[in-house]
């Protein structure tokens, strides 16, 4: 029951907007009475283009509404996110993107692949949303491992590589010094903490190639360090433990069939690098001449027994300990192994699962005399620095 | 009484990015209301940027598109502004204000130089 | 994008008088247009929204009208205090854009 009260005039009758209703619906508005708009679901309440969550009038002394009435517009999304080394494409029809609409995200094939089915429609909320009600758009994650490279490959007693073998090998160069790496993501490169302990701190005086078979072969991907991470269980000149570090590049380089991240090893990768079993290891170092080398060299190598080689380096090299941390590769009678330039590239394996090749080990240190009979390549054991790497790639 | 507050740097170089939050007290900005950034150059010209609405969707001045963003974080009632690659152009007051215009902070004055 | 014209980029007018400032839209913004008073060295205040609905706070001397593309802010009794710059906007259509500001100078 209302009170009209003194001097005041009653207000218009208030008419919902289309896609809208009003509440309360009462016969008469007088002075301090109210109404609520709400719209249909898929509609929004807009004044001009700006949204309201809620809207309330009330009528005022004189007889009129304080605000006008807002519209009920149908929800927009918005043109979608662009999706990098993707596209989108529109399914409900060209460029529509109100409510209900559906898209579908897909990445570049070969070199990208995305976790989700790439479905998205445009809800209530105003957002694209995946039917897993994810509100971001996809990823397109680099394909990883993927290779032209078939073991069978008789670097010291190495051949050369063909384009397309080692996608991921990285060529790191400093003023005076040459390194490798191997790229893990489309913007993370791992290498041997040893190979960029003096940059560290210097990062972006590091020069980075990728996408080469000849080292000073003009038509590579240049590409510039952002930061250097080093494995905080790493002592420079105190044994080689924990020589593993990550470098993360300033911007994320294209994939495509020269330039492609190895995988990591699955978990279940430890039983493929079992002793006997054989890995490839790849770089610019010194040959059996003792020159580095002008084209991409790699040696296919098996892995040797851990406590053979820990004795070995006991007798060769007093104080030197060959860790858990480590794995060893190369022949009893020599010939076949990794050298100085070599330093932080992959030792990679064939996932036969997966057909993939994962990294097992980095290059990492061994005998002055490369592939001399009973003295093996020390690689960096990988599988050990999962967390680590993960750690570092999630934080950074 | 709902306030508006615009905090940055004073002094931004060319090429780099610039940020700036801007914080509500007094109101909820997931109560409602669209939360604008808005500046103004020297000579009194003003430019809206874009807006965060109540529920986080966002609107850009399509000038600006490939440099703005605006984020907000609702647990501390902020709302924030970042444009890439400033240029001696973007010198300017800017001003954080919700829909209506009814609050406005009083700006913060920006100047790109290097 | 919609241009806002504010034609008269200075006016002059004595405490007392009543004096309009116009704005016109490039094209039909309905209502959806908002009129803001800026004294030096401030932050723009919020007179008018929706065309000729006053904000709070605002006296009843400063009134809104118009619709479609014409727009205008009058200022019955001029006030020392009125002293200011005053922009129109509309918020009809993304972006939302404003008009380059009348400044009012009391004689």
């Known amino acids: 029951h209302h009170h009209h009260h003194h001097a005041s005039r009653p207000c218009p009758d208030p008419t919902a907007p289309p896609n809208g209703s009003i509440s309360p619906v009462q016969a008469i508005y007088v002075l301090k009475d109210r109404f609520s708009v709400f719209c249909k679901t898929g509609f929004e309440l807009l004044q001009g283009s700006v949204p309201l969550k809620s809207f309330t009038a009330v009528c005022q002394k004189d007889g009129s509404w304080d605000r006008p009435m807002p519209e009920c517009s149908i929800i927009d999304c918005g043109p979608p996110d662009d999706l990098p080394n993707g596209h989108v494409d529109y399914i409900t029809g060209p460029e529509v993107t109100t409510y209900k609409a559906v898209i579908q995200y897909s990445c570049e094939e070969t070199f990208y692949t995305m976790s989700s089915n790439g479905k998205y429609v445009c809800e209530a909320d105003g957002f694209w949303t995946s039917s897993k009600g994810e509100k971001l758009p996809p990823v397109c994650e680099p394909v990883c491992g993927l290779s032209t490279h078939t073991i069978g490959g008789r670097i010291v007693g190495g051949q050369p590589a063909k384009p397309g073998d080692f996608p991921w090998q990285v060529l790191l160069l400093g003023q005076t010094t040459a390194a490798a790496g191997a790229l893990i993501h489309d913007n993370w490169v791992l290498t041997a903490a040893h190979a960029v302990y003096e940059k560290r701190m210097a990062a972006s005086s590091l020069n980075i190639r990728m996408g080469i078979l000849k080292r000073l072969s003009p038509h590579y991907t240049q590409a510039w360090p952002e930061e250097i991470f080093i494995h905080e269980g790493y002592t420079h000149g105190a044994g080689f433990d924990n020589d593993i570090a990550l470098i993360k590049l300033k911007n994320k380089v294209t994939i495509n069939g020269s330039i492609m991240p190895v995988c990591l090893p699955r978990k279940e990768a430890a039983s493929l690098m079992r002793t006997d079993f054989t890995g490839t290891v790849a770089g610019w170092g010194l040959t059996q001449k003792g020159l580095l080398a002008r084209n991409l060299m790699f040696v296919d190598i098996p892995i040797a027994d851990h406590q053979k080689c820990t004795a070995v380096y006991e007798k060769l090299y007093p104080g030197v300990r060959v860790s858990a941390n480590m794995l060893c590769a190369g022949l009893e009678t020599g010939g076949k192994d990794s050298c100085r330039g070599d330093a932080g590239g992959a030792l990679v394996f064939l996932d036969n699962e997966t057909q993939r090749w994962f990294v097992g080990g980095i290059v990492s240190w061994g005998s002055i005399n490369c592939g001399a009979a009973d003295q093996y390549g020390v690689y960096t054991k990988v599988i050990n620095y999962i967390p680590w790497i993960e750690n570092i790639i999630s934080n950074f | 009484q709902m306030q508006l507050q615009e905090s940055g740097p004073g002094l931004v170089k060319p090429s780099q990015s610039l940020s700036l939050t801007c914080t509500v007290t007094?109101?909820?900005?997931?109560?409602?209301?669209?939360w604008n950034w808005i500046r103004q150059f020297p000579g009194n010209k003003l430019e809206w940027m874009g807006y965060?609405?109540?529920?986080?969707?966002?609107s850009y001045n399509p000038s600006l598109k490939s440099r703005i963003s605006i984020t907000r974080d609702t647990s501390k009632n902020q709302f924030f502004l970042q444009l890439n690659s400033v240029t001696t152009e973007d010198t300017a007051t800017y001003y954080c204000?919700?829909?209506?215009?009814?609050?406005w902070g009083q700006g913060t004055t920006l100047t790109v130089s290097s | 994008d919609i241009v806002m014209t504010q034609s008269q980029k200075l006016m002059s007018t004595s405490v007392g008088d009543r004096v309009s400032v116009t704005c016109k839209a490039s094209?039909?913004?309905?209502?959806?247009v908002a009129w803001y008073q800026q004294k030096p060295g401030q932050s723009p205040k919020a007179l008018i929204y929706s065309a000729s609905y006053r904000n709070s706070g605002v006296p009843d001397r400063f009134t809104g009208s118009g619709s479609g593309t014409d727009f205008t802010l009058t200022i019955s009794n001029v006030q020392s205090e009125d002293l200011a710059e005053y922009f129109c906007q509309q918020f009809n259509t993304n972006p939302l854009t404003f008009g380059s500001g009348t400044k009012l100078e009391i004689k």
């Open positions: 007094g109101y909820s900005i997931t109560s409602d209301y669209a």
């Open positions: 204000a919700r829909h209506y215009g009814d609050y």
């Open positions: 094209q039909n913004v309905g209502t959806n």
């Open positions: 965060i609405s109540y529920s986080g969707r966002t």
